[in-house]
Interface confidence: low
Amino acid sequence: ADNFSLHDALSGSGNPNPQGWPGAWGNQPAGAGGYPGASYPGAYPGQAPPGAYPGQAPPGAYPGAPGAYPGAPAPGVYPGPPSGPGAYPSSGQPSATGAYPATGPYGAPAGPLIVPYNLPLPGGVVPRMLITILGTVKPNANRIALDFQRGNDVAFHFNPRFNENNRRVIVCNTKLDNNWGREERQSVFPFESGKPFKIQVLVEPDHFKVAVNDAHLLQYNHRVKKLNEISKLGISGDIDLTSASYTMI
């Protein structure tokens, strides 16, 4: 595992210790996309191909997999869900100053929020944007999911699973064209049932960095490159959600 400093993580940014992000990385778990145990969906016994025909289970065949909101069909199950309304956005990334002046944070009002919760990201996401989610894991929790969404696509699915075959694991993935990609799995698991948590997601030019309780957890390389189109964060799972907000650092 590499040792990262915050300065390394944000080198060239002119801000070696941006507000709100963990000041020390410690020993970083192996990065997304190349660590041992990363696997294709369907690698476990009994799993069916994603996007399969009626009656087949999605990858990671456990209840609600992966990250479907209540009432939503399992991902990829035929037919796919309709896309949201609206005209397609113009190309090009919004500038940090234009789209997200560093005067935030913006986001949900204080107080308990109803889960699943959607946090609008009106200009998409941009490098140096920090999303902070505060809440408490419910007792006997099964799952948490953060879904950075582009219309029907999920650019970044962050999915702590408390009991997948009696193991705790964090699964990250992307859904494009009604279709889940290759899972990236992380065995470091900082969540505890019944305990409060803070999740921070820092958008970098090439990846998302995720820290939990002020400790770096993982990074996930951008598979959806048009960051300005990632216009919503869905928060779901077995949590009591206190706040969800973002700011520029």
Partner: antibody, heavy 117, light 110 residues
Framework: EVQLVESGGSLVKPGGSLRLSCAAS????????MNWVRQAPGKGLEWISS????????YYADFVKGRFTISRDNAKNSLYLQMNSLRAEDTAVYYC??????????WGRGTLVTVSS | QSVLTQPASVSGSPGQSITISCAGT?????????VAWYQQHPGKAPKLMIY???YRPSGVSNRFSGSKSGNTASLTISGLQAEDEADYYC??????????FGGGTKLEIK
């Protein structure tokens, strides 16, 4: 039966315009992302453009940007490709294709566009 | 010029197995995106044979299999039959929401 039927292909002069249509049936059209793919005579497949179910996201291959426009009318179960400033190298069979399952799972039979003076 | 590289042609005898490769980059085949394979007989529309790297749609013979390693995807056809003679194309999604195709491989049954 799931079906896609293209129409509108014809002989057109360089610099001219043409509008291709694709009629979809047998599935819930609005639930699916759709594509246009073309194949020049004796050549390989070439992806042109895709459009999401709600028309919110639209993408083009670099070689048609600014000349071709993809659109859809979900009420009519129809997909369209407006082609302007046509060139000889645009001569091809144009396929209407449905996206699903990590691949393009339903193809029309294609419509021939010939650009020649 | 195609973004994904396939051999122009391969050949095999009935009953044999052949493999067609599809070389890409970390921006497409190797970038956690999904590779699909299509079969096209002369004068016909392409048909999806493999999706999501290695899965077969309903109705496709289990003689067709797909795999992916790094930036290269492969289509293997076992127990070659005369009707397998066709052109085969690989395709991948990219991070820019476009799709890319290989140049195609002509399979000849000797």
């Amino acid at each position: 039966e799931v079906q896609l039927v293209e129409s509108g292909g014809s002989l057109v002069k360089p610099g001219g315009s043409l509008r291709l249509s694709c009629a979809a049936s047998g599935f819930t059209f609005s639930n699916y992302n759709m594509n246009w793919v073309r194949q020049a005579p004796g050549k390989g497949l070439e992806w042109i453009s895709s459009i999401y179910g709600s028309s919110r996201y639209i993408y083009y291959a670099d070689f048609v940007k600014g000349r071709f426009t993809i659109s859809r009318d979900n009420a009519k179960n129809s997909l369209y490709l407006q082609m302007n400033s046509l060139r000889a190298e645009d001569t091809a069979v144009y396929y209407c294709v449905r996206s699903s399952y990590g691949g393009m799972d339903v193809w029309g039979r294609g419509t021939l566009v010939t650009v020649s003076s | 010029q195609s973004v994904l590289t396939q051999p122009a042609s391969v050949s095999g005898s009935p009953g044999q197995s052949i493999t067609i490769s599809c070389a890409g980059t970390s921006s497409d085949v190797g970038g956690s995106y999904n590779v699909a394979w299509y079969q096209q007989h002369p004068g016909k529309a392409p048909k999806l044979m493999i999706y999501y790297d290695s899965y077969r749609p309903s109705g496709v013979s289990n003689r067709f299999s797909g795999s992916k390693s790094g930036n290269t995807a492969s289509l293997t056809i076992s127990g070659l039959q005369a009707e397998d003679e066709a052109d085969y194309y690989c395709s991948s999604y990219t991070g820019y929401s476009t799709r890319v195709f290989g140049g195609g491989t002509k399979l000849e049954i000797k």
